[in-house]
């Protein structure tokens, strides 16, 4: 009747998976902080910078206590997908001014992509319901000027930094509940 079944496949410890996700997130957080500082030095610009197409911050630090694992990972994945899309757009349409940051933006995009794959893996390891495929997002309009591209870059990096900071706190808190 065929070979005897092998030993059941042991899923890796979800806490270990969560640990490596935290490490990746923290690393990306520092990358983003350093890249934003570099951008501000190259193109000094006063005030806060906003971009309507960016996701709103998922959660205030004070509300972290009420978080549940599926919700956090689903929301984090959705937000990071949006930031990945924005970084890709920035590299493609940001204009010649941002070309000086090309190696760093490329590295940021690759690490963001890696973190998203890690989140996907974590969700399957934890047997969480997989989110439906993302609906096609409307294309982002190119910046109206070189300065518009710089302001967009500052907004994207600022928002990504806040999101990753929230993510680290949330993931560490969730780890204690596993």
């Amino acid at each position: 009747p065929g070979p005897p079944p092998g030993p059941p496949r042991v899923s890796p410890d979800p806490r270990a998976e969560l640990d490596s996700t935290v490490l990746l997130t923290r690393s990306l957080l520092a990358d983003t902080r350093q890249l934003a500082a570099q951008l501000r030095d190259k193109f000094p610009a006063d005030g806060d910078h906003n971009l309507d197409s960016l996701p709103t911050l998922a959660m205030s630090a004070g509300a972290l206590g009420a978080l549940q694992l599926p919700g956090v990972l689903t929301r984090l994945r959705a937000d990071l997908l949006s930031y990945l899309r924005h970084v890709q757009w920035l590299r493609r349409a940001g204009g010649s001014s941002l070309k000086t940051l090309e190696p760093e933006l490329g590295t940021l995009q690759a690490r963001l992509d890696r973190l998203l794959r890690r989140l996907q893996l974590l969700m399957s390891r934890l047997a969480l319901p997989q989110p439906p495929p993302d609906p096609p997002a409307p294309p982002l309009a190119p910046p109206s000027s070189a300065w518009g591209g710089i302001r967009a870059a500052l907004a994207i990096l600022g928002g990504l930094h806040l999101t990753l900071d929230w993510a680290v706190r949330g993931l560490l808190l969730l780890k204690t509940r596993l």
Epitope: L23, S27, A30, R33, P44
Partner: antibody, heavy 120, light 108 residues
Framework: EVQLVESGGGLVQPGGSLRLSCAAS????????MHWVRQAPGKGLEWVAY????????YYADTVKGRFTISRDNAKNSLYLQMNSLRAEDTAVYYC?????????????WGQGTLVTVSS | EIVLTQSPATLSLSPGERATLSCSVS???????LHWYQQKPGQAPRLLIY???NRASGIPARFSGSGSGTDFTLTISSLEPEDFAVYYC?????????FGQGTKLEIK
């Protein structure tokens, strides 16, 4: 050879002010972020402040926020720390330090330090 | 803030012995953001090991670093008289940048 030389330390009364300087040589000063780190007598190291090469991003330790101001003059290859509302607990040797590579925020090279004593 | 705890506080060894210094971090940190410094009495600190395991310029091969996550180690394979000093670990992943309280390596 990278050289960092601090100056401006001394005795000051609580509530007083002092301005520390750090003269840099042996590297392209305008390409590197700089830190101030302090060490109270017989104690460990405490990071105080960081400034990026172009001065557009600055971070402070909570213990000095609102009282200390880090600044730099790239034309003069100089780093500064303006210290106001000084307290006894600010007594320490103050070191300036250069990061390892641009924007990596490390502490690769250190000056010899300047002693600040806050006492009445 | 991320807290670094070094152990032991004091380590008494003889020249030629192996020294193992530990640095425990309150949160998980990526290994590229953990560094070690050496400080001798009356002198400024100097960078010893950066990014967990890379020796800084001019640092002898007897110094090595290892670790990941929350547990990091500085090892001196065979102590020389000039190695007796205070050693600090430091994290650079998060602001505020923080140091451990130091391990004093003294002659037995």
């Amino acid at each position: 050879e990278v050289q960092l030389v601090e100056s401006g330390g001394g005795l000051v009364q609580p509530g007083g002010s002092l301005r520390l300087s750090c003269a840099a040589s042996g590297f392209t000063f305008s390409s590197f972020g700089m830190h101030w780190v302090r060490q109270a007598p017989g104690k460990g190291l405490e990071w105080v402040a960081y400034i990026t090469p172009g001065s557009n991003t600055i971070y402070y330790a909570d213990t000095v926020k609102g009282r200390f101001t880090i600044s730099r003059d790239n034309a003069k290859n100089s780093l500064y720390l303006q210290m106001n509302s000084l307290r006894a607990e600010d007594t320490a040797v103050y070191y300036c330090a250069r990061e390892y590579s641009s924007y990596d925020e490390g502490f690769a090279y250190w000056g010899q330090g300047t002693l600040v004593t806050v006492s009445s | 803030e991320i807290v670094l705890t070094q152990s032991p506080a004091t380590l008494s060894l003889s020249p030629g012995e192996r020294a193992t210094l530990s640095c425990s971090v309150s949160d998980l940190i990526p290994s590229q953001y953990l560094h070690w410094y050496q400080q001798k009495p009356g002198q400024a600190p100097r960078l010893l090991i950066y990014r967990t395991s890379n020796r800084a310029s001019g640092i002898p091969a007897r110094f090595s670093g290892s670790g990941s996550g929350t547990d990091f180690t500085l090892t001196i394979s065979s102590l020389e008289p000039e190695d007796f000093a205070v050693y600090y670990c430091q994290q650079g992943v998060d602001v505020p940048f923080t140091f451990g309280q130091g391990t004093k390596l003294e002659i037995k």
